[in-house]
């Protein structure tokens, strides 16, 4: 009755701050229209990096301020986050709520660790 | 801080209608599902329905489908129930819940006392 | 539908004991979907556990969780005063949403 919801354990961001990872949730029925959230736990805090809702079939869309992007693919949400920084190293969770059509369903990920690093200043060349 | 205040409460007899507001404060409305729980006197916590974040996918309990209409206007931070044809079983203390990030029913409101009789 | 059933109904002890509440579905419950609340008299009910093992903010370390798939249980391991309410378990895993019918743990 439960869904599962898989990703990663863990991603490295790249030099440029920008990370991404797959998420795939078992869906129990039809869904034609899906609920995928960014969630960021640090000490036992949650907070929401961004949500966007899609019809099956059809591209997922952010907010035009949002700093994730993503693709669809059948049960599969491909995520990419921007802008990251040092300070934003944690566990990203990703959920995905079946809205439509009944019943409801709820799957939250275990959460993605994210780890970025700041790159190093260039040195200055005289 | 996080704040769920319902109204709309009081004695109505049976085969009428009430409407039963929840206004809500100290957090973005839209980012949150939420639902009615009620509770009939000395009993247990009985789900009734659920709204979606914009309004469009909506749930309901067998016990009011058909009889209770649930809606929500984000920019006025607003959740309602619509409560039509009313039994002496739907009297109850009727509350709003915020749905937490992770699913559970993280925030409730202090209550609102409906009461069906003749 | 998923039927959460409590036991015991009503739960007697005296502050200083340890409080074990338990809570069965009719199905499989991930145990990312099962919470518990505690209700006292004329209060709406507050979140105490969710993931089945989770803390709420604020909630003391004498109350914990556990459980796997149908089987769940709610502990607290030294009773305070402020602890003799009604528990109910929940699953929100899927609709419709369900809740036990409640352990009442009274004063001995």
């Known amino acids: 009755k439960a869904m599962h919801v898989a990703q990663p354990a863990v991603v490295l961001a790249s030099s440029r701050g920008i990370a991404s990872f797959v998420c795939e949730y078992a869906s129990p029925g039809k869904a034609t229209e899906v609920r995928v959230t960014v969630l960021r736990q640090a000490d036992s805090q949650v907070t929401e990096v961004c949500a966007a809702t899609y019809m099956m079939g059809n591209e997922l869309t952010f907010l035009d301020d949002s700093i994730c992007t993503g693709t669809s693919s059948g049960n599969q949400v491909n995520l990419t986050i921007q802008g990251l920084r040092a300070m934003d190293t944690g566990l990203y969770i990703c959920k995905v709520e079946l809205m439509y059509p009944p019943p409801y369903y709820l799957g939250i990920g275990n959460g993605t660790q994210i780890y970025v690093i700041d790159p190093e200043p260039c040195p200055d060349s005289d | 801080q996080v704040q769920l205040v319902e109204s709309g409460g009081g004695v109505v007899q049976p085969g009428r209608s009430l409407r039963l507001s929840c206004a809500a404060s100290g957090f973005t409305f839209s980012s949150y599902t939420m639902h009615w729980v009620r509770q009939a006197p000395g009993k247990g916590l009985e789900w009734v329905t659920f709204?979606?974040?914009?309004?469009?996918?909506?749930y309901y309990a067998d016990s009011v489908k058909g009889r209770f209409t649930i809606s929500r206007d984000n920019s006025k931070n607003t959740l309602t129930l619509e409560m039509n044809s009313l039994t002496e079983e739907d009297t109850a203390i009727y509350y709003c819940?915020?749905?937490?990030?992770?699913?559970?029913?993280?925030?409730w409101g202090q209550g609102t006392l409906v009461t069906v009789s003749s | 539908e998923i039927v959460l059933t409590q036991s015991p109904g009503t739960l007697s002890l005296s502050p200083g004991e340890r409080a074990t509440l338990s809570c069965r579905a009719s199905?499989?419950?991930?145990?990312?979907?099962l919470a518990w609340y505690q209700q006292k008299p004329g209060q709406a009910p507050r979140l105490l556990i969710y993931?089945?093992?989770s803390r709420a903010t604020g909630i003391p370390d004498r109350f914990s969780g556990s459980g796997s798939g149908t089987d769940f249980t709610l502990t607290i391991s030294r009773l305070e005063p402020e602890d003799f309410a009604v528990y109910y378990c929940?699953?929100?895993?899927?609709?419709?949403?369900?809740f036990g019918q409640g352990t009442k743990v009274e004063i001995k």
């Open positions: 929940q699953q929100y895993g899927s609709s419709p949403w369900t």
């Open positions: 709204i979606s974040y914009d309004g469009n996918n909506k």
């Open positions: 819940a915020r749905t937490g990030w992770l699913g559970p029913f993280d925030y």
């Open positions: 993931g089945a093992f």
């Open positions: 199905q499989s419950v991930g145990s990312s979907y």
